[in-house]
Interface confidence: low
């Protein structure tokens, strides 16, 4: 239904706390360089205005769209051109072009320092002094670094953060209580960020239809007892929610997500028997819980998929009459039978099925032509299964750090032109798939591995789009979203690459490395490893292992030495010489 005042409607639906949080996220995602105080001031102004509209929906400007109201606020910021350059040109446009312009200027890799966590005592002091400001800072810092973070989910993580601080700041040993818990939230939030970015990429590059297909497959796996009409309804609603969030319409997105959660909890009987635990929770926890609810038990009596989609005499007629619906039912039926497949794989199979029908239904004897389609799925299914087995075996053998290094070598060989920081970030993220997925039961590994890798590779593509340097990467990133991971996996050593000259300073280290946290030490070593591969792309695994072992030994020795600086300055050049010899 239409409301006289959109802003009053959203304020009433969401309540003041969530309203303010979402407006802060929206502003932080659009203007990523502004300070917290600048944004907090804008948020307060918008909230005060919303309250006047709640009191009187006919008040001046209350009938304006949210884009108009928010855009006007952003465009009124002083020194916009000085701080944001051509983004200021957006302010010369009218809605909806102005909002589109803001969206195009979102930066997936803003030049902001890493979000450092203060030490426990300081954190607890500022949290106790003003919990609202403390949480506002958290929302601001995460949102500006992740401009497509799923806003209602970010409110959920802020709530988690709040609960952890409330609990741990009351403990004697705050540090050991906070660190593992906050690390857990950070890890989950980072995964949530890349997953959501993938959804927005799907929406932006391939439209709502592509996202809806993803949603149908995912929902059918989770709710195999729901009928096709129910799955379609949920997929349509979920597509709307994601479209709104990806489009910066965060108030509508959060409101519609709450509605969808309400609908699911009120219609459990036609959806799934696993929802009640989620439905007992308060709003943010409920929606989060529903988004990762366990798969319902598959119906025992499902007929073979071939009956309706291969053996039926009416296949071509049914396909011709309503292509999207017929393909949708195929995707639904195949997905509900295969919770053990990745969504990407299911979409590749649906694409293969569609291509087969397009070709065969134009021939003289269609059934003879499409009769073998299910057998033709076999290689498409085997490829990711082999990928999972090979990589999980390697992970079990090497551990997370060693596995990351193996991936780093592989990807540097595939795309040596890509910047070393991007390669290291990608390899570290890709390598975490082992810890995340390889420890799961067999039937959960494939969906976990492939859908996670796809999300990480989407980030690689986004970063590469900014400064395209590798034809290999451009080729894989230009194709369809579901073909990306197989495309990257199939890449081999880039034969067109001219190896980098050996520069001694790249491999020169100083004693300050000794005091770095373990993660930072690893990044330094991995940076050196990528540089080695760029120097010798065809170096064997044994050669690289020799060099890296020598390097690790050198660090260990010098960091334990009484006079570290002397050790680094005398032993460093020897290490460089040995490296050159080992790779000669």
């Amino acid at each position: 239904e239409a409301h006289k005042s959109e802003i009053a409607h959203r304020y009433n639906d969401l309540g003041e706390q969530h309203f303010k949080g979402l407006v802060l996220i929206a502003f932080s995602q659009y203007l990523q360089k502004c300070s917290y105080d600048e944004h907090a001031k804008l948020v307060q102004e918008v909230t005060d205005f919303a309250k006047t509209c709640v009191a009187d929906e006919s008040a001046a400007n209350c009938d304006k769209s949210l884009h108009t109201l928010f855009g006007d606020k952003l465009c009124a910021i002083p020194n916009l051109r000085e701080n944001y350059g051509e983004l200021a040109d957006c302010c010369t446009k009218q809605e909806p072009e102005r909002n589109e312009c803001f969206l195009q200027h979102k930066d997936d890799n803003p030049s902001l320092p890493p979000f450092e966590r203060p030490e426990a005592e300081a954190m607890c002091t500022s949290f106790k002094e003003n919990p609202t400001t403390f949480m506002g800072h958290y929302l601001h810092e995460v949102a500006r670094r992740h401009p497509y973070f799923y806003a209602p989910e970010l409110l959920y993580y802020a709530e988690q953060y709040n609960e952890i601080l409330t609990q741990c700041c009351a403990e004697a040993d705050k540090e050991s209580c906070l660190t593992p818990k906050l690390d857990g939230v950070k890890e989950k939030a980072l995964v949530s960020s890349v997953r959501q970015r993938m959804k927005c990429s799907s929406m932006q590059k391939f439209g709502e239809r592509a996202f809806k297909a993803w949603a149908v497959a995912r929902l059918s796996q989770t709710f195999p007892n729901a009928d096709f009409a129910e799955i379609t309804k949920l997929a349509t609603d979920l597509t709307k929610v994601n479209k709104e969030c990806c489009h910066g319409d965060l108030l509508e997105c959060a409101d519609d997500r709450a509605e969808l959660a309400k609908y699911m909890c009120e219609n459990q009987a036609t959806i799934s028997s696993k929802l009640q635990t989620c439905c007992d929770k308060p709003l943010l926890k409920k929606a989060h819980c529903l988004s990762e609810v366990e798969h319902d038990t598959m119906p025992a009596d499902l007929p073979a998929i071939a009956a309706d989609f291969v053996e039926d005499q009416e296949v071509c007629k049914n396909y011709a009459e309503a292509k999207d619906v017929f393909l949708g039912t195929f995707l639904y039926e195949y997905s509900r039978r295969h919770p053990d497949y990745s969504v990407s794989l299911l979409l590749r199979l649906a694409k293969k099925y569609e291509a087969t029908l397009e070709k065969c239904c134009a021939e003289a004897n269609p059934p003879a032509c499409y009769g073998t389609v299910l057998a033709e799925f076999q290689p498409l299914v085997e490829e990711p299964k082999n990928l999972v087995k090979t990589n999980c075996d390697l992970y079990e053998k090497l551990g997370e750090y060693g596995f990351q290094n193996a991936i780093l070598v592989r990807y540097t060989q595939k795309a040596p032109q890509v910047s070393t920081p991007t390669l290291v970030e990608a390899a570290r993220n890709l390598g975490r798939v082992g810890t995340k997925c390889c420890t799961l039961p067999e039937d959960q590994r494939l969906p976990c591995v492939e859908d996670y890798l796809s999300a990480i590779l989407n980030r690689v593509c986004l970063l590469h789009e900014k400064t395209p340097v590798s034809e290999h990467v451009t080729k894989c990133c230009s194709g369809s979203l579901v073909e990306r991971r197989p495309c990257f996996s199939a890449l081999t050593v880039d034969e067109t690459y001219v190896p980098k000259e050996f520069k001694a300073e790249t491999f020169t280290f100083h004693s300050d490395i000794c005091t770095l946290p373990e993660k930072e030490k690893q990044i330094k070593k991995q940076t050196a490893l990528a540089e080695l591969v760029k120097h010798k792309p065809k170096a064997t695994a044994e050669q690289l292992k020799t060099v890296m072992d020598d390097f690790a030994q050198f660090l260990d020795t010098c960091c334990k030495a009484a006079d570290k600086d002397t050790c680094f300055s005398t032993e460093g050049p020897n290490l460089v010489t040995r490296c050159k010899d080992a790779l000669a």
Partner: nanobody, 115 residues
Framework: QVQLVESGGGLVQAGGSLRLSCAAS????????MSWVRQAPGKGPEWVSA????????RYAESVKGRFTISRDNAKKTLYLQMNSLKPEDTAVYYC????????GSQGTQVTVSS
């Protein structure tokens, strides 16, 4: 099509008893927790009691604890509410719902307790 049909309501004196039934069809009854919800005239829906899918775990609103008993028979796809020591404030339309939701998807059965 999911269907819930309540029965067993009626007019009863304060202190009396009633047993409500809810016959379910169109879904796998044994897989879902169920609830009773009531709505008094001019008021919003109020959750009364819930029972898990196996009939083991039961929960009650404070206002009915010790007087009402929820149970189920999965073979018969039926949910029950035994109401003892009824009070005038128990007067309402009683609905059964799937899960622990206060949304009404059925007609309900009227319970009137006179003093």
């Amino acid at each position: 099509q999911v269907q819930l049909v309540e029965s067993g309501g009626g007019l009863v004196q304060a202190g009396g008893s009633l047993r409500l039934s809810c016959a379910a069809s169109g879904f796998t009854f044994g897989s879902f927790g169920m609830s009773w919800v009531r709505q008094a005239p001019g008021k919003g829906p109020e959750w009364v009691s819930a029972i898990d899918s196996g009939g083991v775990d039961t929960r009650y609103a404070e206002s009915v604890k010790g007087r009402f008993t929820i149970s189920r028979d999965n073979a018969k796809k039926t949910l029950y509410l035994q109401m003892n020591s009824l009070k005038p404030e128990d007067t309402a339309v009683y609905y059964c719902t799937i899960g622990q939701s206060t949304s009404r998807g059925s007609q309900g059965t009227q319970v009137t307790v006179s003093s």
